[in-house]
Interface confidence: medium
């Protein structure tokens, strides 16, 4: 007697590992014979698909070697046109051993940046990822996380995170690891110990010495008044990362000496600077030709501005320099109590520089005029604003003369880097804080420097500390 | 000595893309920026874009924005510009140059070196 | 955009005459104006940078000056070498524009 199809097995769900074979089967009972069809995920898997294997009049079906993609749910329905047409489906899960799809690799690192090692792994079940860093499994803590795509990420990167590190990434059908890579850990040039100055006599030997560490090594240069060191000899030695360099100097003038300690990270440098200062007992009284001397600056408000010990020029046309030169600054620094704090340490800067300009030791001691350029960038980019209200008050007659001529620099008059880059003296606060600055180029000087955020209040000394440390 | 040269122009079709390359020597790239320029056969200077190493920042004319890409590899010490979905009227040659200083005052000191400059053709 | 119009587009002038180029900017904008000079089939060569810094190797009859939005390039004595186009170019703005040309010919 005819009989409508009843599924006598239904489907049920099939685990199956990538590259293996995986079957349903879908047993019936009907007269006359019925005709079984198979679909994955609603779409009928044609009879010639050789990706699949169709038996027992249908009701076997295997999938040869099963992908990642054949994840979903598979029905069988028969048919023998006797009753209705009768449905069984069952889900396929493709597990999958832990694969690594996206391995970490050698990493060098500034310390005190983030370091990110990549992970990123498959697998079914999800694997979990864990780290190793030599030996040991590796713990997290407050700096050192393992991300949920399995990265791990290390905030702050300290010496001692340096080392070898691999991934782990596990499931329940097994372990893989990843190739062992190196987190090198790159530390910024630092003097330890800077040269001293010293008062003595015409004719005397000297020794400065200079300690700086740093990975890798630094290398150390000296600079004597700003080119390099033409006479003395040098004797270096290295030890644990630290270099130790000692200049000896037969002194028969004054100078400024500077131990640049500078080492390589990538292809950018990182540079500290220390200075001492060589004075002859005697030498720095002005003679009647010089304009002025140079000195040690020993004022008060422009303390956070110049390098500490910066040698500074002097006046002589004033009766008091120091007195003089530093009331000037003391009046100009009180008009910037009102300007905005974008303008302001910038302001600060070519203030204490032009009116204590950097100074040039020598027969004849040479004060050395601020960049033009960098004039320029305080007039027209940071102090637009400020600088025509300032312009403004010196034609009103607001301000004395001689004020107006030592405040404000006529920026067009000052030598340009392009002439010759140690015959003017920079701005050492713009150079410090370049990455701060979000809007450039400069916007157009009817848009101010309001467009800059994250530049220092003038509390900060971040830029003028000395030793001083910036990246070139 | 400073040098900037300029490579990968050539003849492409309308909708094609390009890439051009400017390898630089003699300075400090990274303390640089390069822009790239280009003069279509008897015109003018057109500025197309620019990036400031430093700070890693681009800059395009609206001619060309979202069609071209610069790029710098500061290891490399080459600049790039991805010239895709190219017109007839990009048809120039272009050339690379930089501008030097220091982040801030970079705009003050104009394009000091220029590369020979590379022929773009966009034609069917 | 700030435009930089030039003028004027061509001149005729001899040897040994002074010859003046403007460049109006559509806006108010900084000092970072440069002028080039530009011969036929070579790159463009930097004249004058921050709107009147003479860039090293330049000659001295080579000058540039700012007046408001208005920016000057003056030879001083024309030379048979200074025949050749001129274009000023602003980077006041994240936008750069150059001036259309001026094409200094032998009268």
């Known amino acids: 007697l005819p009989k409508a199809p009843v599924i006598t097995t239904p489907l049920e769900t099939v685990d199956a590992l990538v590259e293996e074979v995986a079957t349903f089967m879908c047993a019936v009972e009907s007269y006359p014979q019925p005709e079984i069809s198979w679909t994955r995920n609603k779409i009928l898997i044609k009879l010639f698909d050789t990706r699949y294997s169709i038996r027992e009049n249908g009701q076997l079906l295997t999938i040869l070697s099963v992908e990642d993609s054949d994840d979903g749910i598979y029905c069988c329905t028969a048919n023998n046109g006797v009753g209705g047409a009768v449905e069984s489906c069952g889900a396929l899960q493709v597990k999958m051993k832990p694969k690594i799809t996206r391995p970490p690799i050698n990493v060098k690192i500034i310390e005190g940046l983030k370091a990110v090692l990549p992970c990123t792994t498959m697998g079914n079940p999800k694997p979990s990822v864990s780290w190793i860093k030599g030996d040991s499994p590796l713990r997290e803590n407050s700096r050192i996380a393992v991300l949920e795509s399995g990265s791990l990420r290390i905030h702050n990167v300290q010496k001692e995170d340096a080392g070898q590190y691999r991934c782990v990434a596990k499931n329940s059908l097994g372990t893989a690891y990843s190739k062992v890579v190196k987190l090198e850990v790159e530390v910024f040039a630092r003097i330890l110990r800077a040269p001293e100055s010293h008062n003595v006599t015409f004719g005397s030997f000297v020794t400065l010495h200079c300690t700086a560490t740093g990975i890798p090594v630094p290398t150390i240069t000296w600079i004597e008044n700003g080119n390099a060191v033409s006479s003395g000899s040098i004797q270096e030695s290295v030890k644990d990362r630290v270099i130790d360099s000692r200049l000896q100097l037969f002194i028969t003038k004054p100078g400024l000496y500077t131990c640049i300690a500078t080492n390589k990270h990538g292809e950018k440098f990182s540079t500290a600077k220390a200075a001492a200062t060589i004075s002859i007992a005697e030498w720095s009284k002005p003679q009647k030709d010089n304009k002025g001397y140079c000195a040690q600056y020993r004022g008060e408000v422009c303390n956070a501005v110049l390098a500490k010990d910066a040698l500074v020029f002097l006046n002589t046309s004033y009766a008091d320099p120091e007195e003089a030169q530093e009331l000037l600054v003391h009046t100009a620094w009180n008009e910037l109590k009102v300007v905005s704090p974008v303008c302001r340490p910038a302001a600060e800067a070519l203030l204490c520089n032009h009116i204590f300009q950097e100074c040039s030791p020598g027969v004849v001691p040479t004060p050395i005029p601020i960049c033009r350029e960098y004039c320029l960038a305080v007039k027209e980019l940071f102090c637009a604003k400020e600088w025509l209200v300032m312009e403004e008050k010196t034609h009103r007659g607001l301000y004395r003369s001689e004020m107006h001529l030592l405040s404000v620099p006529e920026c067009s008059k000052l030598p340009s880097m392009h002439w010759d880059p140690t015959a003017c003296a920079r701005l050492p606060h713009l150079d410090y804080n370049k990455e701060n600055l979000k809007t450039f180029p400069p916007m157009t000087s009817s848009k101010p420097s309001v467009d800059i955020p994250n530049l220092p209040s003038s509390s900060s000394s971040s830029f003028s500390v000395s030793p001083t440390y910036s990246m070139t | 000595e400073v040098q900037l040269v300029e490579s990968g122009g050539g003849l492409v079709q309308p909708g094609g893309s390009l890439r051009l390359s400017c390898a630089a020597s003699?300075?400090?790239?990274?303390?640089?920026?390069i822009h790239w320029v280009r003069q279509a056969p008897g015109k003018g200077l057109e500025w197309v874009a620019s990036?400031?190493?430093?700070?890693?920042?681009?800059y395009y004319a609206d001619s060309v924005k979202g069609r071209f890409t610069i790029s710098a590899d500061t290891s490399k010490n080459t600049a790039y510009l991805q010239m895709n979905s190219l017109r007839a009227e990009d048809t120039a040659v272009y050339y690379c140059?930089?501008?030097?200083?220091?982040?801030?005052?970079?705009?003050?000191?104009?394009?000091?070196?220029w590369g020979q400059g590379t022929l773009v053709t966009v034609s069917s | 955009d700030i435009q930089m119009t030039q003028s004027p587009s061509s001149l005729s002038a001899s040897v040994g005459d002074r010859v003046t180029i403007t460049c109006r900017a559509s806006?108010?904008?900084?000092?970072?104006v440069a002028w080039y000079q530009q011969k036929p089939g070579k790159a463009p060569k930097l004249l004058i940078y921050?709107?009147?810094s003479l860039y090293s190797g330049v000659p001295s009859r080579f000058s540039g000056s700012r007046s408001g939005t208005d920016f000057t390039l003056t030879i001083s004595s024309l030379q048979p070498e200074d025949f050749a186009t001129y274009y000023c170019?602003?980077?006041?703005?994240?936008?750069?524009?150059f001036g259309q040309g001026t094409k200094v010919e032998i009268k």
């Open positions: 140059a930089r501008s030097g200083g220091e982040f801030y005052i970079t705009s003050y000191y104009g394009m000091d070196y």
């Open positions: 003699g300075f400090t790239f990274s303390s640089s920026s």
């Open positions: 990036i400031y190493s430093s700070s890693g920042s681009t």
């Open positions: 806006q108010s904008v900084s000092s970072a």
């Open positions: 921050s709107a009147s």
């Open positions: 170019q602003q980077s006041s703005s994240s936008l750069i524009t």
